[in-house]
Interface confidence: low
């Protein structure tokens, strides 16, 4: 007999064909020989089967000798052997209905675990293979577990259930709640306005929660809370903000913070946390601020940077249109008795300039 796999909640069509392409008498019955539907004259008749309210046939195909039975809103318990009686012959079709569902909410925080559970008819022995949006393959039986969700696991998971050399495909949308970036660094000259942006890697119809930015300045012995805020239906409202620095926050998403001036005392690292309503755990994004200052004091031209810089970054002082005068993998460089002209202080990573500050040295007579 033919085996057909179906998906819980979906629609399935069981086909039954007569040898002659014409309208003829037919009946669909279940394994208990209870009539589900059939034809009487030109009309579809339905029997007392529990399936009757969800079963139908394509009337438009009857005159082609096709007497299919459509079952909508499939349930696991619809798994059965169905019999089509047409032209004094019986055709049997075994229908196996499977369901695949996420055990918890499909909106999960980064690092949380995901469990997919397969519902299957008694007596079946299916195998399940799931593929994440990032191409990760996971196999299992009745359950499939992903211990620690990553940002790239967000999207449609495609799971294939196999039974008797037949397959049925499920698509489950998983949303990993995280910021787009785990960490970001802003490089600014002293006195410049600083913009911090914290875009989310997901969209939700209603987004409500609360957040806070803790800041560890390089020069400070301990961290402090710079700002706390609430998020209600994607609208941002500031609850509390320090007087120094006095951060400003955008009222709409993405979360956006403005520091009026980049100053050496603000250089450091911050951690923005966001707790979402009805979710356990918090979203995190690290943000770093690197500040550059170029100064001339008497015969000394100095360039300094503050904040979290990698040891491989190079700080250089050079006179415009000339080679590097001084270059170090350090946080400060200086030139004694600098030549007159426009000097450039450059913070670079493998030749790529991250931050640049110009200072004019006037001739001393």
């Amino acid at each position: 007999k033919k085996v057909v796999l179906g998906k819980k909640g979906d629609t399935v069509e069981l086909t039954c064909n007569a040898s002659q392409k014409k309208n003829t008498q037919f009946h669909w019955k279940n394994s208990n020989q209870i009539k589900i539907l059939g034809i009487q004259g030109l009309f579809l008749t339905k029997g007392p089967s529990k399936l009757s309210d969800r079963a139908d046939s394509r009337k438009s195909l009857w005159d082609q000798g096709c007497f299919s039975m459509i079952i909508k809103n499939l349930k696991i318990e619809d798994s059965d052997t169905y019999i089509c009686e047409v032209e004094n012959k019986k055709e049997e079709v075994e229908l196996l209905v499977f369901g695949l569902t996420a055990n918890s909410d499909t909106h999960l925080l980064e690092g949380q675990s995901l469990t997919l559970t397969l519902e299957s008819p008694p007596g079946s022995s299916p195998s399940v293979k799931c593929r994440s949006p990032g191409g990760k393959n996971i196999q299992g039986g009745r359950t499939i577990s992903v211990p620690q969700l990553e940002r790239q696991d967000s999207g449609t998971w495609t799971c294939t259930v196999s039974q008797d050399q037949k397959t049925v495909e499920f698509k489950i949308d998983i949303v990993v709640l995280a910021f787009q970036k785990a960490s970001s660094t802003v490089y600014k000259k002293e006195g410049e306005q600083v913009e911090f942006s914290f875009p989310l890697a997901f969209t939700l119809e209603k987004l409500t929660g609360s957040g806070e930015l803790w800041w560890q300045a390089e020069r400070a012995s301990s961290s402090k809370s710079w700002i706390t805020f609430d998020l209600k239906n994607k609208e941002v409202s500031v609850k509390r903000v320090t007087q120094d620095p006095k951060l400003q926050m955008g009222k709409k998403l993405p979360l956006h913070l403005t520091l009026p001036q980049a100053l050496p005392q603000y250089a450091g690292s911050g951690n923005l946390t966001l707790a979402l309503e009805a979710k356990t755990g918090k979203l995190h994004q690290e943000v770093n601020l690197v500040v550059m200052r170029a100064t001339q004091f008497q015969e000394n031209l100095t360039c300094e940077v503050w904040g979290p810089t990698s040891p491989k970054l190079t700080l250089s002082l050079k006179l415009e249109n000339k080679g590097a005068t001084v270059s170090k993998q350090a946080k400060a460089v200086w030139v004694l008795n600098p030549e007159a002209g426009m000097w450039q202080c450059l913070l670079s990573d493998s030749g790529q300039v991250l931050l640049e500050s110009n200072i004019k040295v006037v001739p001393t007579w």
Epitope: D10, S60, D63, C66
Partner: antibody, heavy 120, light 107 residues
Framework: QVQLQESGPGLVKPSETLSLTCSVS????????WSWIRQPAGKGLEWIGR???????NYNPSLKSRVTMSIDSSKNQFSLKLSSVTAADTAVYYC??????????????WGQGATVTVSS | DIQMTQSPSSLSASVGDRVTITCQAS??????LNWYQQKPGIAPKLLIY???NLETGVPSRFSGSGSGTDFTFTISSLQPEDIATYYC?????????FGQGTRLEIK
């Protein structure tokens, strides 16, 4: 929710074959029939035919000799080919989902339409 | 093929009016009939299925009735956004066929 998007050349020369593809997103192509309907400018709707994932097809007898439909479940796409076209085949071509349920049959989801002009 | 004949082919009515469109099938199609609305430059939208059932999300001012060969589509109180062309469609037998359409305008 399910969305449909037609794609293919907007201009076809007379006697050549018109080819269009409909991409299904937001849902599986399985279990449903998928139809093609066309509408010449300022005129009514004409059903061309339909296909399902078992590759069962039904074509409008008026076009049957020139129509071929195919389906690719792995790409969530189905296609229409109409051969030996003439200026009379100039129309907006729509793909649509045939939804069947109890006491219900209808084209419940449509693409936005692809304008095809037959001209040399 | 089953022929579907709509009348009138066009009509003009005022906001708030009751509007009626009829559709006649060339043979008995039981209640295998749908009504669609098509606004200019947009794909048709299913309004009524099975001759008289309102599709989910469709305003209740739209209704359908009839069985066999004669069907009626009614807008109880015409709204400006109802300006469109309306089509009946039979699905009793293949090929599926549509009426020629009724263009509805505001006076």
């Amino acid at each position: 929710q399910v969305q449909l998007q037609e794609s293919g050349p907007g201009l076809v020369k007379p006697s050549e074959t018109l080819s269009l593809t409909c991409s299904v997103s937001g849902g599986s192509i399985s279990t449903y029939y998928w139809s093609w309907i066309r509408q010449p400018a300022g005129k009514g709707l004409e059903w061309i035919g339909r296909i399902c994932t078992t590759e069962n097809t039904n074509y409008n007898p008026s076009l049957k000799s020139r129509v071929t439909m195919s389906i690719d479940s792995s790409k969530n796409q189905f296609s229409l080919k109409l051969s030996s076209v003439t200026a009379a085949d100039t129309a907006v071509y729509y793909c649509a989902r045939d939804l069947e349920r109890l006491n219900y049959y209808g084209m419940d989801v449509w693409g936005q339409g692809a304008t095809v002009t037959v001209s040399s | 093929d089953i022929q579907m004949t709509q009348s009138p082919s066009s009509l003009s009515a005022s906001v708030g009016d009751r509007v009626t469109i009829t559709c006649q099938a060339s043979q008995d199609i039981s209640n295998y009939l749908n009504w669609y609305q098509q606004k200019p430059g947009i794909a048709p939208k299913l309004l009524i299925y099975d001759a008289s059932n309102l599709e989910t999300g469709v305003p209740s001012r739209f209704s359908g009735s009839g069985s066999g060969t004669d069907f009626t589509f009614t807008i109880s109180s015409l709204q400006p956004e109802d300006i469109a062309t309306y089509y009946c469609q039979q699905y009793d037998s293949l090929p599926i066929t549509f009426g020629q359409g009724t263009r509805l305008e505001i006076k």
